[in-house]
């Protein structure tokens, strides 16, 4: 938890999601007026988000403690967990409508469909997860989290396809780190870096975290990674408490949530 | 430190393309923007475009856009301008200069120009 | 497009003397850039954000102004800033130059 780049962070939390993004001016929070938030988001490429693209961005994940400007002159910020100090205690869109004076300062809300994104929250029953531009080598630089949430009592069965991430001995430079639970602070599984593919994993519960971390040097490959829903009936009973069983690593049983 | 290494010197004729070239070196290419300023023999300075080099994006101003194409590659930090259909008015010292991506912007470095001559 | 009209387009100067340039600009800009440049050499930033000195820039450089109207000031004038200064705007497409004012020694 903390703030980084006037951003509210708890991994849970997008900094860029449905092709939506926070822009603040290089002199910081507040220093645009809606002519230069226009501006900001057409240097990019893009133009000022509409309040339903920043909504739906917001329900995939999309929190930014900020209010910054939108299309048409309205401005607003997107939460999705309520806090003492952002949000007044409310989720959605908190709106402050369209402005009349529009040399007002706040931030921007970019929406760039062609943005390069990364990560996510997904309840699908399965889906692949690639390094951002695979099977180009990634990017420097680069930081994504994709988020799993699954039903009640199901599992996630996680299976790497393809890896190649850039190899040091601590996998301190690019590396893929596993979460068995809804964030990157509890139920670490394990940091993976070089061309070895990991054994599969199976969560204890039915949400896990991925992270891709790269640094702002050598890039390599790049990976695939597929889940797969388990099903709490075919689920072996002999996978309950084992850690590895075969080239499935188990892990036992320590969150659950709704 | 931060270096951007033009290409040397070109003569072309008229109608002809070059390609002027721009390699980084001292920092992460993928992280700033690189812009093209043109100026001709004792005239003042003008913007011809940029790209973002890490998604490829780029723009040009209006009276550029059917003369200078912008690319990268990433692997090499190297940042292109190629100019087609050369007439004489495109004689000038071309530099490749880096901003930041934050806004407003501005260039912290610039490489040493390439001089274009275009002549029959 | 943001036109940047600098004031004057020549000058000269003895050393000791305070020197004062000016932009204008046709459409407000939030800040204000100003480069160096002398003969045959390449640019190099010399105040950013109106009022901030790149690095290596002696003190007696300073610059001001807000909105359409800014200023580069030289409080004592010596031999090596002959130069030729341009203003620049980053705030609207397309980014712009001033014309420049060339500064000399008298």
């Known amino acids: 938890w903390g703030f980084k780049n006037g951003i509210f962070h708890n991994s849970i939390w997008l900094e860029q999601a449905a092709g939506v993004y926070h822009r603040e001016a290089r002199a910081g929070r507040y220093k645009l007026t809606y002519a230069e938030a226009k501006a900001v988001c057409e240097f990019e490429g893009g133009r000022l988000a509409t309040y339903k693209q920043l909504e739906a961005a917001r329900k995939i994940g999309f929190h930014v403690c900020a209010a910054g400007w939108m299309a048409k002159g309205r401005v607003g910020y997107p939460i999705v967990k309520p806090g003492p100090n952002c949000g007044f205690g409310k989720t959605g869109i908190i709106d402050y409508g369209i402005r009349l004076n529009r040399s007002e300062r706040w931030d921007a809300y970019c929406y760039n469909p062609h943005a390069k994104e990364c990560g996510g929250v997904f309840t699908d029953p399965k889906r692949i997860f690639k390094s951002p531009g695979f099977p180009n080598e990634y990017d420097d630089n680069q930081v994504c989290y994709w988020h799993i949430r699954l039903k009640y009592g199901q599992r996630i069965h996680l299976s790497f396809l393809d890896f190649d991430l850039e190899h040091d001995p601590g996998c301190l430079a690019d590396y893929v780190e596993i979460y068995d639970s809804y964030d990157d602070v509890h139920g670490f599984v394990g940091r993976y870096c070089g061309d070895e593919l990991p054994e599969d994993i199976i969560s204890t519960g039915n949400v896990m975290t991925l992270k891709f971390l790269s640094d702002a040097s050598v890039t390599a490959g790049g990976f695939q990674i597929k889940y797969v829903t388990v099903d709490p009936a075919s689920k072996s009973s002999q996978a309950k408490n084992t850690s590895t069983t075969g080239n499935k690593k188990f892990l036992p049983g320590r969150f659950s949530h709704l | 430190q931060v270096q951007l290494q033009q290409s040397g010197a070109e003569l072309a004729k008229p109608g002809a393309s070059v390609r002027l070239s721009c390699q980084a070196s001292?920092?992460?290419?993928?992280?700033?923007?690189m812009h093209w300023v043109k100026q001709r023999p004792r005239q003042g300075l003008e913007w011809i475009g940029y790209?973002?080099?890490?998604?490829?994006?780029?723009k040009c101003h209006q009276k550029f856009k059917d003369k200078a194409t912008l690319t990268a590659d990433k692997s090499s930090s190297t940042a292109y301008m190629q100019l087609s259909s050369l007439t004489y008015e495109d004689s000038a010292v071309y530099y490749c200069a880096r901003s930041t991506s934050g806004y407003p912007y501005y260039f912290d470095s610039w490489g040493q120009g390439t001089t274009l001559t275009v002549s029959s | 497009e943001n036109v940047l009209t600098q004031s004057p387009a020549i000058m000269s100067a003895s050393p000791g003397e305070r020197v004062t340039m000016t932009c204008s600009a046709t459409?407000?800009?939030?800040?204000m850039h100003w480069y160096q440049q002398k003969s045959s050499t390449s640019p190099k930033l010399w105040i950013y954000?109106?009022?901030k000195l790149a690095s290596g820039v002696p003190g007696r450089f300073s610059g001001s102004g807000s909105g359409n109207s800014y200023s580069l000031t030289i409080s004592s004038m010596e031999a090596e800033d002959v130069a030729t200064y341009y203003c620049?705007?980053?705030?609207?497409?397309?980014?712009?130059f001033g014309a420049g004012t060339k500064l000399e020694l008298k």
């Open positions: 001292g920092y992460t290419f993928t992280s700033y923007w």
């Open positions: 459409s407000s800009v939030s800040f």
């Open positions: 620049f705007q980053g705030s609207w497409y397309p980014l712009t």
């Open positions: 790209i973002i080099p890490s998604s490829g994006y780029t």
């Open positions: 954000d109106t009022s």
